[in-house]
Interface confidence: low
């Protein structure tokens, strides 16, 4: 059931996954929605008693999809939009007055206003958010300074009240970046830069979509199922570099490399993975096992089960089960399978729940 | 591979599950061994630089069963005994001089020596460990005071150096407690006291074994698969009370209740679950899927896979697969299935790796 309303002075007890910092409850709800496992959240507003907890956004999960409600001044709680049918966007154009969003300040320069600062952030490969000191800022030498910031998670490491500054987010997810959009996928290629994370993926296209939605991934290398080293098969390496481009390109068979589409305006979905993967089993944490007619029905079942992230359909019992096969509904900590097996006859795929979370549909 | 040796001045990087406090590296290794997921650990000795980290035992896991080694003064690292063939015991009779193991001090009284204090702890239902102030303790009125302590995890919440005290653990796991050992399982019974945890279990015997090895479980209630409320089926509620006994016994069909065997001397294993559960599927996080001949072979496969905690064997493909069925190797955060399904034809069970971790084999 889709619950849009926020509950003031209510704290959801338990179920904590992680805590991030967001400027308000609305943004916390969006962060929860895009998190692979978050179903509920509690945001601690400035009216809460403990000032050290202000702006903290506590992401929560629950097998029952609900948690006990406790009265708490300044807490604002709600549910993710995962349960909702409407189209979503991570695009956030809001400017937050008198808030300093904290992160690694890797670039500081003068801009004439906050809008120009936001544009600079949007057009810098590494920038997640910015803080801009207005012309009323107490110390003269910091006035009109635009600080570009990034963090390992893409979210602020803290938020504090600071008079005469404004903060905001990069508008890359609004499809407003002027940075290069490179759609090519390079076969027989390994990029040899910093790995920031690795996930298991069935093909290079899924790897690219995961890279696109990872806060720090600028390019990727994917090792196919034929890669010689078994432990690296179906591995998607998410990568970055200081320059924003790969420094070294190595020729290797059975590997493919490419770039994040974060700077692109998309005519195709880049968040959801709608294909079926034949003779492929996705391994993960099992949510349920149900009998259904065919792999499309299994995908539908996964999409309608709020905690399901991916599935494997096994038709081995179809013949003696009224044409029904077994549908394994699964999840993991990051939304990707923990392992992929081939040659066992399964048909696997992902929830279509994420299709409503896609970017602005205009071609660039 | 079994690695018993400890690595001095070496820190295992990454893979953290949780941090507990132990008086030395040897005890840290035992804690890691009994933890459902720990494969490696790092212990911070007194020779380490940061005194706030002294005595911390960092439990770690790794899909590859190894982690990068980093040089660090005062760190002691090693591997769990899960990989080892020898019989194990959680029994720890050591007395730690000049160490205060911290927890909830719920009972303080005079004893003539540390041994008597340890006996008092062993014979108190709630006591996990104790600290005893010797007759050289600075303040006269605290001398010979025996403080009984407990914590939510059974492990100290901190350990600090304190002159003229000694500390140690309860000897319940050495089968030395004089507390009552109640082996009866009461059918059609619900105990209505504090739930401290709940796990999924296939039957009341497994529920009892889990209760026995939970630091604070004194008794339990198990809801069978016929229990009317679906969400409670196969649920094992771990319970406690201040008195150490259930306050209320309610008559309910399809429920069974009983007591922890922590005070018993066992002639039967109480840590490992060796039975097979027919027409039963255990759900969890999938580790691997392999083809094997029969459910015994599947159990063997799980026992030899170090991270495997339980399994489900499906024989549906046996007929057209050279007599082989599918063996699903699984794990979870607490070693128990996340859900149990009936009527799907699977045969499920647990790793036998835990059988070597059992209590002293003497009948009481």
């Amino acid at each position: 059931e889709c619950v849009i309303k926020l509950f003031s002075d209510i704290y959801f007890q338990g179920g904590d996954i992680t805590t991030v910092y967001t400027p308000n409850a609305k943004h916390c709800q969006v962060v929860c929605t895009y998190h692979p496992r978050c179903l509920l959240f509690t945001f601690m507003a400035e009216s809460s008693v403990d000032s050290t907890k202000w702006f903290s956004c506590i992401l929560k999960d629950s097998v029952t999809e609900s948690l006990p409600k406790v009265n708490m001044t300044g807490a604002i709680s709600g549910y993710s939009f995962k349960q909702c049918p409407h189209q979503l966007s991570a695009c956030n154009k809001d400017i937050y007055v008198d808030l300093d969003m904290q992160g690694m300040n890797y670039n500081g320069s003068v801009t004439k206003n906050a809008q120009e600062c936001q544009e600079r952030c949007t057009n810098d490969a590494h920038c997640h958010f910015f803080t801009y000191a207005t012309r009323q800022f107490p110390s003269a030498e910091h006035r009109n300074i635009c600080l570009l910031k990034y963090t390992q998670t893409g979210a602020p490491t803290g938020i504090r009240k600071l008079k005469k500054v404004v903060s905001g987010f990069s508008l890359k997810s609004c499809a407003l970046s002027n940075l290069a959009c490179i759609r090519d996928i390079f076969p027989s290629t390994v990029f040899a830069d910093n790995n920031i994370d690795s996930v298991v993926a069935p093909d290079a296209l899924v790897c690219r979509r995961i890279c696109t939605h990872h806060p720090n991934c600028l390019f990727f290398t994917f090792f196919s199922q034929e890669w010689p080293k078994e432990s690296h098969r179906n591995l998607c390496l998410l990568k970055t570099s200081e320059s924003g481009l790969p420094s070294t390109r190595i020729h290797k068979n059975q590997a493919l490399s490419g770039f994040s589409l974060q700077n692109c305006r998309h005519s195709i979905p880049v968040f959801c993975h709608s294909s079926f993967y034949y003779d492929t089993d996705f391994l993960g944490e099992e949510l349920d096992i149900v009998d259904v007619k065919g792999h499309e029905a299994c995908q539908k079942m996964c999409t309608s089960a709020i905690r399901c992230q991916f599935f494997t359909y096994s038709s081995s019992q179809e013949s003696h089960n009224k044409g029904k096969g077994t549908c394994y509904l699964k999840l993991s900590s990051n939304g990707s399978p923990t392992k992929i097996l081939h040659g066992r006859g399964g048909i696997s795929g992902y929830t279509l729940r994420l299709c409503k979370m896609d970017n602005v549909c205009t071609t660039k | 591979e079994c690695v018993i040796k400890l690595f001095s001045d070496i820190y295992f990087q990454g893979g953290d599950i949780t941090t507990v406090y132990t008086p030395n590296a040897k005890h840290c290794q035992v804690v890691c061994t009994y933890h459902p997921r720990c494969l490696l650990f790092t212990f911070m000795a007194e020779s380490s630089v940061d005194s706030t980290k002294w005595f911390s035992c960092i439990l770690k896991d790794s899909v590859t069963e190894s982690l990068p080694k980093v040089n660090m003064t005062g760190a002691i690292s090693g591997y769990s005994f899960k990989q080892c063939p020898h019989q194990l015991s959680a029994c720890n009779k050591d007395i730690y001089v000049d160490l205060d193991m911290q927890g909830m001090n719920y009972n303080g009284s005079v004893t003539k020596n540390a041994q008597e204090c340890q006996e008092r702890c062993t014979n108190d239902a709630h006591c996990h460990f104790f600290t005893y102030a010797t007759r050289q303790f600075p303040s006269a009125e605290h001398r010979n005071i025996c403080l009984l302590k407990y914590t939510q995890t059974g492990a100290p919440t901190g350990i600090r150096k304190l002159k003229k005290v000694v500390s140690g653990f309860s000897l319940k796991s050495c089968a030395l407690s004089n507390l009552a050992c109640i082996r009866d399982i009461f059918p059609s019974t619900v105990f209505a006291d504090n739930n401290i945890d709940s796990v999924v279990a296939p039957d009341a015997l497994v529920c009892r074994r889990i209760c026995t090895h939970h630091p604070n479980c004194l008794f339990f209630t198990f809801f069978s698969q016929e229990w009317p409320k679906e969400s409670h089926r196969n649920l094992c509620l771990l319970k406690t009370s201040e008195s150490g006994l259930p306050s209320t016994r309610i008559h309910k069909n399809q429920a069974l209740s009983g007591f922890s065997l922590q005070n018993c001397r066992h002639s039967i294993p109480v840590f490992c679950h060796s039975s097979f559960y027919y027409d039963t599927d255990f759900l969890g996080e999938e580790l691997d899927i392999v083809d094997v001949k029969g459910h015994e072979a599947c159990q063997k496969m799980c026992t030899s896979a170090i991270r495997c905690q339980f399994f489900t064997y499906s024989s549906s493909q046996e007929s057209h697969n050279k007599g082989k069925g599918t063996c699903y190797l699984k794990l979870s955060s607490n070693g128990s299935p996340t859900k149990i399904l009936h009527g799907r034809g699977g045969i499920s069970g647990y790793t036998l790796r835990l059988c070597k971790m059992d209590n002293v084999c003497t009948t009481k």
């Epitope: - | 001090n105 303080g108 303040s139 600090r160 150096k161 002159k163 003229k164």
Partner: nanobody, 126 residues
Framework: QVQLVESGGGLVQPGGSLRLSCAAS????????MAWYRQAPGNECELVST???????YYADSVKGRFTISRDNSKNTLYLQMNSLRAEDTAVYYC????????????????????WGQGTLVTVSS
Amino acid sequence: QVQLVESGGGLVQPGGSLRLSCAASEFTFDDSDMAWYRQAPGNECELVSTITSDGGTYYADSVKGRFTISRDNSKNTLYLQMNSLRAEDTAVYYCAADQWGSAEGDCTSSYPGGYWGQGTLVTVSS
């Protein structure tokens, strides 16, 4: 009779400094771990800082970098130098012979915290 007597509290402006002292008598001071606790109205007893008999120190996160604990065994005296004071540091500060780890709840209870002084009030206000 064991005695711990605190002094040095008072009213100070935000950003200001104070030095608290605690004179101990009638027990083996140099063999004891010592501590400063504080309790603001309506709040739980909070451990501020400890110093072991051999000089090892611990500070609560909220005071790290601002407060310094020290001891002079020849004078049987414990000190707390408090700099960059904030409004949230307002509380009654108690000196304790920290023989059983941190106190739970009320700073004035004798069990399990060891010995306590009578407390000295620190008020940070403009």
